[in-house]
């Protein structure tokens, strides 16, 4: 694949990841009622974030915002955070790596400044989807415990009034937003990894170049017995190299100046 | 304002399936479930189950579940009941109801009274 | 199914007195999600079909008279007229609003004296 195919590729999957991340952040539905017993409730609960919502069979939804910030789990507040992180490095990134791609020119941005910045948005994306990642399953073990926590309570010491009266407990398993958010996650960290994979195909070749400043002679050069090649580039392969005023390019280099099929 | 209009009696043989209507408006009528309730003389309330006008999704009273069946015609904003194989014991005022909060039924028809004889 | 048990199942006051009437349920109508307890009452007269009183086991609805009062939480429920008017004869019916079957009580008859 090519160094452009995989920048543009690793920006747009990071993008898509990046969009779902901020998506799971603000869905409702991180935890879910469990309907297992009862597949069909006529209150249907479910919590996310930052607001807990009530859906009647009646078709009326009522949701309350979590007013208060001390009366918060920790964990909650965690996972809070780590999402918010994961966004915030994600437009970081975004930005940065819109700058880095190579289709795009900016004054006389070289292609060593574009490796950096390749390279910065995709630590950038890695550490988001990474983010994103822990913060999600931070919350999902968060709901196992819960549940298994709920579920021995409904089998012990049922209900009061010597046991006439159940008391209806309320289970939560994963929500949409769990799902989106793994997913999300996962293809901004693949997006960061393409980007530092491109990355390594926008830096130019130093060694291959810089070690040697004379020009071998042409006598030298027939006395050598076999191997040592004038650039000394130690063994690497130069083969799709090609010299222009004494610095280095690769032949997708060669196609850096826009034309109109750059732009898509 | 809101109404939901049902014949005022019908009388139907025994065996004989009979289709009770409910005829909505003053309302969106596919944004509110229609539920119907059976109440025999000088007795209580019966939910027997609910359907949803938009994609006519139903739930039912297992008690009634191969008794009624719950159907909507939604150009003419129109709820039906059909109940199968109709014996005395099916001779009640079937209500039907809009659903509100709370699961709540906050408009009522008139009621049919359904006579089942021969 | 959750059983709903009305106590008394009827009761005669004169007009101008406080009454209160008891439902109970065999399982708890509080949903945790929202703090609301779905249990909702119905008032019927005779000959016609019951209306709405009180949903959420104590919100009013609309055009109901504030002498009405519904309270209570979990599976104890309160429905007070506090103070009877002739009008208010009618058979009382609370119902199960938390989880199908949809169940009612079987009644508290109200007369007046």
């Known amino acids: 694949m090519s160094v452009t195919a995989c920048q543009g590729l690793g920006f747009v999957v990071s993008l898509i990841g990046f969009a779902g991340i901020i998506a799971a952040t603000c869905m409702d539905q991180w935890s879910t009622q469990d309907l297992y017993n009862n597949p069909v409730t006529a209150v249907f609960n479910y919590q996310g974030l930052w607001r807990s919502c009530v859906r009647e069979s009646s078709g009326f939804t009522e949701c309350r915002g979590y007013f208060t910030l001390l009366g918060l789990p920790a964990m909650l507040q965690a996972v809070r955070a780590l999402m918010i992180v994961g966004i915030v490095l994600g437009v970081i990134g975004i930005l940065v790596s819109i700058f880095a791609l190579k289709c795009i020119r900016i004054g006389s941005m070289d292609d060593s400044a574009k490796a950096k910045m390749t390279l910065t948005s995709g630590i950038l994306f890695i550490i988001s989807g990474i983010s994103a990642i822990i913060g999600v399953s931070v919350f999902a073990n968060m709901l196992v415990t819960n549940f298994w926590m709920s579920t021995a309570n409904m089998y012990s010491g049922m209900g009061g009034m010597g046991g006439m009266v159940q008391t209806v407990q309320t289970r939560y398993t994963f929500g949409a937003a769990l799902f989106v958010g793994w997913v999300a996650g996962g293809l901004t960290l693949i997006g960061g990894v393409m980007m530092c994979i491109a990355c390594r195909g926008l830096t130019p070749d130093d060694s291959n170049f810089k070690a040697v400043s004379y020009h071998a002679s042409g006598q030298n050069v027939a006395y050598r017995p076999g191997g040592f090649k004038a650039s000394t580039g130690f063994g690497s392969n130069t083969r799709n190299k090609k010299i222009y005023d004494g610095g280095a390019r690769t032949e997708d280099d060669e196609q850096s100046h826009p034309t109109k099929y750059d732009y898509v | 304002q809101v109404q939901l209009q049902q014949p005022g009696a019908e009388l139907v043989r025994p065996g004989a399936s009979v289709k009770l209507s409910c005829k909505a408006s003053?309302?969106?009528?596919?944004?509110?479930?229609i539920n119907w309730v059976k109440q025999r003389p000088g007795q209580g309330l019966e939910w027997i189950g609910n359907?949803?006008?938009?994609?006519?999704?139903?739930n039912y009273n297992q008690k009634f579940k191969d008794k009624a069946t719950l159907t909507v015609d939604k150009s003419s904003s129109t709820a039906y009941m059909q109940l199968s194989s109709p014996t005395s014991e099916d001779s009640a005022v079937y209500y039907c109801?809009?659903?509100?909060?709370?699961?709540?039924?906050?408009?009522w028809g008139q009621g049919t009274t359904l006579t089942v004889s021969s | 199914d959750i059983v709903m048990t009305q106590s008394p199942s009827s009761l005669t006051v004169t007009a101008g007195e406080k009454v209160t009437m008891s439902c109970k349920s065999s399982?708890?109508?509080?949903?945790?999600?929202?703090?609301?307890?779905?249990l909702t009452w119905y008032q019927q007269k005779p000959g016609q079909p019951p209306k709405l009183l009180i949903y959420w086991a104590s919100t009013r609805e609309s055009g109901v008279p504030d002498r009405f009062t519904g309270s209570g939480s979990g599976t104890d429920f309160t429905l007070t007229i506090s103070s009877v008017q002739a009008e208010d004869l009618a058979v009382y019916y609370c119902q199960n609003d938390y989880s199908y079957p949809f169940t009612f009580g079987s009644g508290t008859k109200l007369e007046i004296k």
């Open positions: 003053g309302y969106t009528f596919t944004s509110y479930w």
């Open positions: 399982q708890s109508l509080l949903n945790s999600g929202n703090q609301k307890n779905y």
């Open positions: 109801t809009r659903s509100w909060r709370g699961n709540s039924f906050d408009y």
């Open positions: 359907i949803y006008p938009s994609d006519s999704y139903t």
